[in-house]
């Protein structure tokens, strides 16, 4: 069956300066390919985190994505600022040249509250 990307939270609220976790789990690791987090949709979407060797300031993975059976691709955003507000999507790709997007989570809206 086709892999599903599940983002259980519709929205999260976080105070500026605090950290928040955006949850994402997959039903399968197949087909082989990367998982990436984006803010927004379409051509203007912004890459927030990729479960690869790249480094992203203030964004970290919650569990060890290198473990073979791990299906949790949640991320933690630290020191949240008002500019971090928006809808975040966890997206599964199939490896190729280039990688092909095959499934997206439903999105989690991040609301940033004044401290």
């Amino acid at each position: 069956t086709e892999v599903k990307v599940i983002q259980p939270e519709k929205s999260v609220s976080v105070a500026a300066g605090d950290s928040t976790v955006l949850n994402c789990t997959l039903t399968s690791l197949l087909p082989v390919g990367p998982i990436r987090w984006y803010r927004g949709v379409g051509q203007s979407r912004q890459l927030i985190y990729s479960f690869t060797t790249e480094h992203f300031p203030r964004v970290t993975n919650v569990s060890d994505a290198t473990k073979r059976s791990n299906l949790d691709f949640s991320i933690r955003i630290s020191n949240v600022t008002p500019e971090d507000a928006g809808t975040y999507y966890c997206v599964k790709f199939q490896r190729g040249s280039p990688d092909t997007e095959i499934q997206s989570g439903g999105g989690t809206e991040v609301y940033v509250l004044a401290k």
């Epitope: 599903k4 599940i6 983002q7 259980p8 939270e9 519709k10 929205s11 999260v12 039903t27 439903g106």
Partner: antibody
């Protein structure tokens, strides 16, 4: 106090149509996703359809896809369910249910309206 | 689609007794599970969400536990108003949202 009041139920012949309404009050209607959930006589709960606060996101149960249409009018604080090509198995009490703002569980329900499909 | 199976179908108990209701999921729903109570002729009422958090105004004799695929709703000491049908619902997966088949708690 949150209030959800359904109307529009009744007896209808198979193949005919019916439109249900749900009037909402006591909360900012446009900020919440709302659903229709039904319950056949003596049976359990069955989720029917969901519409997001803006109306942009819509889902249906496979059992009603292509026959039922969910919509909302945020200026009137009202949710609708247009039911076409009705079948005997659509006979049920139809509830409108307001979702929690963070998760897809239901923290408020209407009292329900009975739809009976019979010749 | 995630299937929820509730057991037993009917529970016959006396007031003051402890009721234990079970809900099993066909795959893990983590703690994204809610419980509802429904009395005859009434709409369902939210009791528990997040597997173990009581909804506003719900008495503390109701408690929920579990995670993953196995969940329990416990009523520590049944009151007359607790005799009803109880449903679990998962909200982990995006729609279709699914309910269990229900457990009827009746007076013995």
């Amino acid at each position: 106090e949150v209030q959800l009041v359904e109307s529009g139920g009744g007896v209808v012949q198979p193949g005919r149509s019916l439109r249900l309404s749900c009037a909402a009050s006591g909360f900012t209607f446009s900020s919440y996703d709302v659903n229709w959930v039904r319950q056949a006589p003596g049976k359990g709960l069955e989720w029917v359809s969901l519409i997001s606060g803006s109306g942009e996101i819509i889902y249906y149960a496979d059992s009603v896809k292509g026959r039922f249409t969910i919509s909302r009018d945020n200026s009137k604080n009202t949710l609708y369910l247009q039911m076409n090509s009705l079948r005997a198995e659509d006979t049920a009490v139809y509830y409108c249910a307001k979702e929690n703002n963070r998760y897809r569980f239901f923290d408020d329900w209407g009292q329900g309206t009975l739809v009976t499909v019979s010749s | 689609e995630i299937v929820l199976t509730q057991s037993p179908g009917t529970l016959s108990l006396s007031p003051g007794e402890r009721a234990t209701l079970t809900c099993r999921a066909s795959q893990s729903v983590y703690t994204y599970l809610a419980w509802y109570q429904q009395k005859p002729g009434q709409a369902p009422r939210l009791l528990i969400y997040g597997a173990s958090s009581r909804a506003t105004g719900i008495p503390d004799r109701f408690s929920g536990s579990g995670s993953g695929t196995e969940f329990t709703l416990t009523i520590s000491s049944l009151q007359s108003e607790d005799f009803a049908v109880y449903y679990c619902q998962q909200y982990y997966d995006r729609p279709p949202l699914t309910f269990g088949g229900g457990t009827k708690v009746e007076i013995k």
